[in-house]
């Protein structure tokens, strides 16, 4: 069970010195989102018993193992149910405290029922201040019973549940018709999945006999022990004052334990500490009395006395539980509560015990959970004792459970059961994943999720190139790390294994999956530089470049172009594709911008140093579009344009650019200049009769600026096939050349 | 479907007897507290009688007590009434009733009802 | 024992109007103690309200009631058709009911 335990402050003269604690013993818990998990949590639980709403309790860190709520400030504050939530994964659990006010008009004689499968539950409210009216059982918030107030039994209202089941357990409370809730007399009912002394899927195994009040956890048939008890049976008493499964934990405080109500994970419940009694748990045992709710009664023999917090203290040459043993009685000594193996593993098993006679190696026997009894196969005998060593066969995941080590001699006979948890080394459900790679080494995250158990003690990384015959190559590594694989060979498939180890011999688990890590290419090493650079238009750049001669293959994929616009903080690449190109054509850059430019060779994804940067200024973008174009033919070889020029112009026009193309041909177009830019019209001849024609001009001032509209027209009539179409402005007579 | 069918009823003379049963089904019987409630011709609603889910405790109107007698058998979800010594002031509709209590708020006391009703038997007092 | 008195006795009212009904106790009634039911003609009566002003399950927000000590009062604030009909107080005391007389 998880070692988890929350306390109530229950010295109830002012609310607000009112504190509930939650504490654990588990390894890292409450540290939240770190590798240990989730925190603690404690809360009040508002599903059941509703309280009106007041201020917001405090919940305070004290440390990573503990969580203290305070900020009570009146009695109503205090009713009701609170729940601690601790451990992780499968093996988080909620310990719950219900409490109830001092006040009410009906108080439980018995706050936590625990019961066995097909019991009968019968929960008790005392009359505390009466009221002629009915009363109201409910089961987790929902009416269950009604009992007239003639059916009270010795001031008592009693609710009679036979042969429960485990979905009766929960929070029940009684409650007089037009009473507040808060003047309820609040239960918790915890019913075990099982019948007495039985656990296990189908109840099939057999309680370890808890001592001293404690209870066997229906899941896995572990004892546990009520507050101030210890050891796989409760068989030990913690030293006054301390609690927790290993009695680690000190009761806060100079009176110790008293006025402390202590709620552990079910189907324990809650009771008092060790040696203290009372609805507040403020009450001495009575002598005779002792532990937990002072439940037990000593009954010492052979001269033992009776000590509250652990039972019989047995005078010399006397043990056992009422001193009822005497010391010439075998005994077993020293054995562990709790031994943990390995599967498949052979683990030796050490007994030891005294007594008079003494024991000898044929008088020490173990025996299993399932019955079988093994022989000791050697004996070292001492004055004080004989240690008997057993060879256990290969352990299987059956034997988890309960053994025990018996002696036998003609004094009388003894013997100590021990849980014995055997655990399935851990092995890799998914491969390592691969975080980043380089030439010559690769970055690893080697934790996955696993089956078995852990902790996982070491991981263990196997690699080796792929399709290889060649032995692994192993690494050791901390769980929590990445790791890297160092001095591979470039560009080289890896399959890579991880192989996980929990504590003990034979912890060592199969190896997980394997998966492929490729490292990457070599890194070019040649450094290009960068020959020259023309502008071919305002948009236009054309780059060349070279590199060094070195002897051997070019080490390299291709090129990448960058230009880098400081000014709006832009970089601009391009990839060329072919390691033998040494030019290309830059496109679509903007005009009139101061541009850095450079050129690196790249392999795989790596690039090689870059050229020295040069810097290109592109002249600035032409002017916007001439106007309104229209044109009309003339003759069967000559169609006039008009235009109106460019609005907003930012300066003087040297010329216009006609393109002229025949509708629907496949050749490329042809451009005619107009050096005249005052002119608005020119003549387009040497064109063919009938011909369809398309026309588009722009205008140039320091660049070319953008096309206009196009236009169509036809040439008129049949006439001659022209030699091609030539330009005429208005008040020129010269043609110009195409 | 929680379901309550009353029978029994019928013509006595004054001074007879009759029993009247409610059959419940659709719901836990042994655990609610059941009442008998009455309506004479054109009159309104009179409450006749209780009993606790143990049996064990039951209350009377006045008009009624050390006449009548309210009983129920768990094992067999059926609420009864034995009517002894008729009166013609008897005629009435009968009707079976359960008793439930509500949270009336979150915070606040118990509310009790009488939250399902049978369609009632007749039961005619005449000479 | 209580005694439980309604009035008006009989309420005219058409679709859409408001009802207001009353119900006095002739000593004090704990509110959560006070209940009220309707009734159709040949039909059983129905829980509407418990503890003075709580609806029972299915009842429309159309109904409220309200009231302590003596005097409760039942609301419906916009009639329908189907809530023309007959209807009770109650109380419930010494493990007793008793009803207005409707």
């Known amino acids: 069970a998880v070692d988890l335990t929350l306390l109530a402050n229950l010295r109830l003269t002012d609310p607000q010195r009112f504190f509930l604690t939650c504490v654990s013993g588990e390894a890292g818990a409450g540290r939240g989102s770190d590798a240990w998990g989730p925190p603690l949590l404690l809360e009040k639980d508002d599903r059941i018993v509703r309280t009106p709403p007041g201020p917001p309790l405090r919940l305070a860190r004290n440390g990573s193992h503990q969580v203290t709520l305070r900020g009570f400030s009146k009695p109503s504050d205090l009713v009701g149910v609170f729940s601690c939530v601790g451990g992780a994964g499968a093996r988080r659990t909620r310990v719950i405290y219900v409490h109830n006010s001092p006040g009410a008009h009906l108080l439980p004689d018995k706050v936590t029922h625990t019961v066995n499968k097909g019991d009968t539950a019968v929960l008790s409210a005392r009359v505390h201040k009466e009221k002629q009216t009915d009363v109201i059982w409910k089961s987790n918030g929902s009416y269950f019973y009604t009992l007239d107030w003639h059916e009270a039994q010795d001031g008592r209202f009693l609710l009679q549940l036979p042969n429960v089941q485990p979905p009766s357990s929960g929070i029940y409370s009684a409650t007089y018709l037009e009473a507040s809730p808060l003047g309820s007399a609040f239960f918790r009912l915890i019913v075990r999945g099982c019948g007495a002394g039985r656990w296990g899927p189908g109840c099939t195994k057999e309680c370890p006999g808890c001592l001293h009040g404690g209870v066997c956890h229906d899941h896995d048939g572990e004892c546990v022990c009520p507050p101030g008890f210890t050891g796989t049976r409760c068989e030990q008493a913690c030293r006054e004052g301390r609690f927790g499964q290993s009695c680690q934990e000190q009761c806060p405080g100079i009176s110790g334990c008293r006025g402390l109500t202590f709620c552990l994970p079910d189907p324990y419940g809650c009771s008092c500490g060790s040696g203290w009694r009372g609805s507040q748990c403020q009450e001495a045992c009575a002598p005779g009395h002792f532990g937990a709710d002072c439940r037990l009664q000593c009954q010492c023999q052979n001269g033992g006395t009776c000590d509250r917090f652990s039972g019989c203290v047995c005078p010399s040459g006397w043990h056992g539980v009422h001193c009822e043993k005497s010391d010439r009685i075998p005994q077993i000594l020293n054995m562990a509560s709790e031994l943990e193996f390995n599967l498949e593993t052979m683990p030796r098993i050490n007994c030891a015990a005294a007594g008079n006679p003494f024991p000898v190696r044929g008088s020490i026997e173990l025996r299993k959970p399932d019955g079988t009894v093994l022989l000791s196969t050697k004996a070292i005998v001492e004055p004080e004792k004989t240690t008997a060593e057993f060879e256990v066969p290969r352990l299987v995941l059956a034997d988890s459970g309960f053994w025990e080590c018996r002696v036998s001699t003609s004094g009388g006979q003894d013997s100590r059961r021990f849980k014995v948890n055997v655990k399935v080394p851990p092995v890799p459900l998914a491969a390592p994943r691969l975080l980043t790679k380089q030439s010559r080494q690769l970055v690893v995250s080697p934790l996955v999720s696993f089956s078995g158990d852990g902790p996982i003690s070491t991981v263990r990384l196997h690699y080796r190139p792929q399709d290889s015959t060649m032995d692994w190559s192993t690494i050791v590594v901390d769980p929590s790390e990445n790791v890297t694989l160092m001095n591979l060979r470039p560009k080289t498939g890896y399959s890579v294994r991880v192989q996980l180890s929990r504590p003990g011999e034979g912890g060592e688990g199969a190896w997980g999956p394997p998966t492929l890590m490729t490292t990457d290419c070599p890194e070019p090493l040649l450094q290009p530089w960068l020959e020259g650079w023309h502008v071919e238009g305002t948009d236009r750049l054309r780059v060349s470049w070279s590199l060094p001669l070195v002897p051997g293959p070019l080490v390299g994929d291709g090129f990448l172009l960058r230009l880098w616009d400081g000014t709006r903080g832009q970089e601009r690449r391009e990839n060329v594709s072919s390691p033998q190109a040494r030019t290309a054509l830059l496109t679509g850059l903007t005009p009139g911008t101061h541009y850095q430019l450079d050129v690196q060779l790249y392999h795989c994804t790596l690039l090689g140093p870059a050229s020295p940067p040069a810097h290109v200024l592109l002249p600035p973008s032409g002017p916007p579009a001439p106007r309104h174009l229209h044109a009309q033919a003339l003759s069967d070889s000559e169609i006039q344009l008009t235009w109106k020029h460019p609005e907003a112009l930012p300066g003087p026009i040297s010329k216009y650019v006609v393109e002229v193309q025949v509708a629907g041909g496949a050749g490329d177009p042809l451009w005619i200049d107009v050096d005249r830019p005052e002119e608005t019209s020119t003549i387009i001849r040497g064109l063919n009769a009938s011909t369809r024609y398309l026309f588009r001009m722009r205008a140039s001032i320091q660049g070319l600026g953008d096309w206009s509209n196009t236009v169509e027209e036809s040439t008129l009539g049949n006439g001659l096939q022209a030699e091609g179409p030539v330009q005429e402005s208005r008040a020129a007579e010269e043609g110009l050349d195409q | 479907e929680v379901q309550l069918l009353e029978s029994g009823g019928g013509l006595v003379q004054p001074g007879g007897s009759l029993r009247l049963s409610c059959a419940a089904s659709?719901?836990?019987?042994?655990?609610?507290?059941m009442s008998w409630v009455r309506q004479a011709p054109g009159k309104g609603l009179e409450w006749v009688s209780s009993?606790?889910?143990?049996?064990?405790?039951?209350k009377y109107a006045d008009s009624v007590k050390g006449r009548f007698t309210i009983s129920r058998d768990n094992s067999k979800n059926t609420l009864y009434l034995q009517m002894n010594s008729l009166r013609a002031e008897d005629t009435a509709v009968y009707y079976c009733?359960?008793?439930?209590?509500?949270?009336?708020?979150?915070?606040?006391?118990?509310?009790?009802?009488?939250?399902?009703w049978g369609q009632g038997t007749l039961v005619t007092v005449s000479s | 024992d209580i005694q439980m008195t309604q009035s008006p006795g009989t309420l005219s009212l058409s679709p859409g109007e408001r009802a207001t009904l009353s119900c006095r106790a002739s000593q004090s009634v704990s509110s959560s103690y006070l209940a009220w039911y309707q009734q159709k003609p040949g039909q059983a009566p129905r829980l509407l309200i418990y503890?003075?002003?709580s609806r029972a399950t299915g009842i429309p927000d159309r109904f409220s009631g309200s009231g302590s000590g003596t005097d409760f009062t039942l609301t419906i604030s916009r009639l329908e058709p189907e809530d023309f009909a007959v209807y009770y107080c109650q109380q419930y005391g010494s493990s007793r009911w008793t009803f207005g007389q409707g």
């Open positions: 009733a359960r008793v439930n209590y509500y949270d009336s708020s979150g915070y606040g006391p118990i509310a009790p009802g009488l939250d399902y």
């Open positions: 659709g719901f836990t019987f042994s655990i609610y507290k």
């Open positions: 503890g003075a002003s």
């Open positions: 009993i606790y889910p143990s049996g064990g405790q039951t």
